[in-house]
Amino acid sequence: MHSDCIFKKEQAMCLEKIQRANELMGFNDSSPGCPGMWDNITCWKPAHVGEMVLVSCPELFRIFNPDQVWETETIGESDFGDSNSLDLSDMGVVSRNCTEDGWSEPFPHYFDACGFDEYESETGDQDYYYLS
């Protein structure tokens, strides 16, 4: 599947997941904490201040690194899955902290967490960027 299609599909699913999570957690615009978000790469569930959210590497990296195998499971499509099954020491896991000032940046950054073969990528001339 082309990356544009993957992103549009994942973004739509993300917004649905966030809405369901907001209802489950009783979140609204005035709630303290961090709203769920689609960062143009992957989906982040709403979180309370002090909470660390872990996600598996997004689908994009299966295009970038078709041979890459991660030990972690992919987060379920119907909801946000169980973050407790993920561990930051695993390859293929990215985290964000919810602070009083909002979300931190991903840790590690996506390339460091998900792997990126810079030299392999230069063999093809395909464009993997997408329309936001």
Partner: antibody, heavy 120, light 107 residues
Framework: QVQLVESGGGVVQPGRSLRLSCAAS????????MHWVRQAPGKGLEWVAV????????YYAESVKGRFTISRDNSKNTLYLQMNSLRAEDTALFYC?????????????WGQGTLVTVSS | EIVLTQSPATLSLSPGERATLSCRAS??????LHWYQQKPGQAPRLLIK???QSLSGIPARFSGSGSGTDFTLTISSLEPEDFAVYYC?????????FGPGTKVDIK
């Protein structure tokens, strides 16, 4: 090897505009975030802006927000910085740097810089 | 924004000596703290990523430690080419920031 070459610097009067360019080669430009970082003469480094691999995410330092615009043309392997309403305190050597990430990342390779002097 | 403070501002040492540079963040940056070296007339060079991760091509005498708000860059035995300015940089929260730098000069 990764190469970043900045251009477009020069002497400009306060209030005027300038556009910097950064030509990238030696890596798949369209897959990496890119940064602008500046350094005033004899001073330290100041982070200016970052743009994600496709241009969908752009972030700025407070000191330049609303005046500077970061953009990229992946078909030309070129990064840009449009600088409007320039001030004397914008005088600096402007570096473009590759971000080791798709979204933001930390700068891992740097160009040699282009000097911007804002003076009347 | 997160403010990074580096100390000392200047470190005067002789070749062969050990250099210990400090970087303190105004709030936690986890391990998203990176170190750069800059020599006069040159662009900065990435030395250490994520507080302590070494990079290929960087001599083993450079090492980093710390997490949260306190970080250290150590040069185990100074070589003549190590006299330069060292900057820490946080990529934990936007806007990203650099420390003011520590100049390591020859005593």
């Amino acid at each position: 090897q990764v190469q970043l070459v900045e251009s477009g610097g020069g002497v400009v009067q306060p209030g005027r505009s300038l556009r910097l360019s950064c030509a990238a080669s030696g890596f798949t430009f369209s897959r990496f975030a890119m940064h602008w970082v500046r350094q005033a003469p004899g001073k330290g480094l100041e982070w200016v802006a970052v743009i994600s691999f496709d241009g969908g995410n752009k972030y700025y330092a407070e000191s330049v927000k609303g005046r500077f615009t970061i953009s990229r043309d992946n078909s030309k392997n070129t990064l840009y910085l449009q600088m409007n309403s320039l001030r004397a305190e914008d005088t600096a050597l402007f570096y473009c740097a590759r971000g080791y990430d798709i979204l933001t990342g930390y700068p891992d390779y740097w160009g040699q810089g282009t000097l911007v002097t804002v003076s009347s | 924004e997160i403010v990074l403070t580096q100390s000392p501002a200047t470190l005067s040492l002789s070749p062969g000596e050990r250099a210990t540079l400090s970087c303190r963040a105004s709030q936690s940056v986890g391990r998203s703290l990176h170190w750069y070296q800059q020599k006069p007339g040159q662009a900065p060079r990435l030395l250490i990523k994520y507080a302590s991760q070494s990079l290929s091509g960087i001599p083993a005498r450079f090492s980093g430690s710390g997490s949260g708000t306190d970080f250290t860059l150590t040069i185990s035995s100074l070589e003549p080419e190590d006299f330069a300015v060292y900057y820490c940089h946080q990529s934990s929260r936007l806007p990203f920031t650099f420390g003011p730098g520590t100049k390591v000069d020859i005593k």
